[in-house]
């Protein structure tokens, strides 16, 4: 992981850009805490394992979250 930071927030910049759910390895949603006041959404991409910080307020990202949770609920028995 680049930039070992003392502050617990991870995201210095965020992206509104939509992410194709099929290109996602992992999606982490970190709720606000005493260490970081932001909701942080970190997408790990299949290609090269690159990570992106996503904007939780972006319409495209909200749609992505819906798609991912729908996919998860399909898979769970």
């Amino acid at each position: 992981i680049p930039l070992s930071r003392t502050v617990r927030c991870t995201c210095i910049s965020i992206s509104n850009q939509p992410v194709n759910p099929r290109s996602l390895e992992k999606l982490e949603i970190i709720p606000p805490s005493q260490f970081c006041p932001h909701v942080e959404i970190i997408a790990t991409m299949k290609k090269k394992g690159e990570k992106r910080c996503l904007n939780p307020e972006s319409k495209a990202i909200k749609n992505l979250l819906k798609a991912v949770s729908k996919e998860r609920s399909k898979r769970s028995p």
Epitope: I1, P2, V7, C9, C11, R52, C53
Partner: antibody
Framework: QVQLVESGGGVVQPGRSLRLSCAAS????????MHWVRQAPGKGLEWVAV????????YYADSVKGRFTISRDNSKNTLYLQINSLRAEDTAVYYC????????????????WGQGTLVTVSS | DIQMTQSPSSLSASVGDRVTITCRAS??????LAWYQQKPEKAPKSLIY???SLQSGVPSRFSGSGSGTDFTLTISSLQPEDFATYYC?????????FGGGTKVEIK
């Protein structure tokens, strides 16, 4: 296209204060981490400070900690650097720079740079 | 802090030459390395990020390679507009640090 325009530099006496500004346009400023980088005359580049997209996180180089304050006003698309207790060694061109545009987690490389503003500390 | 050592500090070359600049980190930085070009009295310009990814709009004659501690910037065929100073920069950990620069001059 992305534009960063610094202002506020000038000749100041040691011990005085100065506030630099960086007006941003052509990208989503409120999503972008922003940095200040400086360059002393005839020398290399030195990173000074960073602020996250909404102004909550700030980091500073040890050489400026406690004297410099980075801040931003997302409603005005403007980045600031407040410099207190100026020293001769603070003489430099100060550049503002954006984080890499793709916003990969942990990015700390600089995509776009302003033209710089010269701060000269001299009695 | 991670120290970045660039070599050579200056070099003379002719138009059409292949030019190689190296950058060494004092500890491993994976691929978290960027290269910048700076012309006199101008702001630096981003050339390469993540060690080998070309910034949008940068000519393909520029390329970067390496990972860990040893990195290279190559200009395959030097053009008149490439005479400038080049800096490497690590962004594996704060503070981001730059190499001392390599000045590419006309032979």
């Amino acid at each position: 296209q992305v534009q960063l325009v610094e202002s506020g530099g000038g000749v100041v006496q040691p011990g005085r204060s100065l506030r630099l500004s960086c007006a941003a346009s052509g990208f989503t400023f409120s999503n972008s981490g922003m940095h200040w980088v400086r360059q002393a005359p005839g020398k290399g580049l030195e990173w000074v400070a960073v602020i996250d997209y909404d102004g909550i996180i700030q980091y500073y180089a040890d050489s400026v900690k406690g004297r410099f304050t980075i801040s931003r006003d997302n409603s005005k698309n403007t980045l600031y650097l407040q410099i207190n207790s100026l020293r001769a060694e603070d003489t430099a061109v100060y550049y503002c720079a954006t984080e890499r545009g793709t916003h990969y987690y942990g990015s700390g490389s600089f995509d776009y740079w302003g033209q710089g503003t010269l701060v000269t500390v001299s009695s | 802090d991670i120290q970045m050592t660039q070599s050579p500090s200056s070099l003379s070359a002719s138009v059409g030459d292949r030019v190689t600049i190296t950058c060494r980190a004092s500890q491993g930085i994976s691929s978290w390395l960027a290269w910048y070009q700076q012309k006199p009295e101008k702001a630096p310009k981003s050339l390469i990020y993540a060690a080998s990814s070309l910034q949008s709009g940068v000519p393909s004659r520029f390329s970067g390679s390496g990972s860990g501690t040893d990195f290279t910037l190559t200009i395959s065929s030097l053009q008149p507009e490439d005479f400038a100073t080049y800096y490497c920069q690590q962004y594996n950990s704060y503070p981001p640090t730059f190499g001392g620069g390599t000045k590419v001059e006309i032979k």
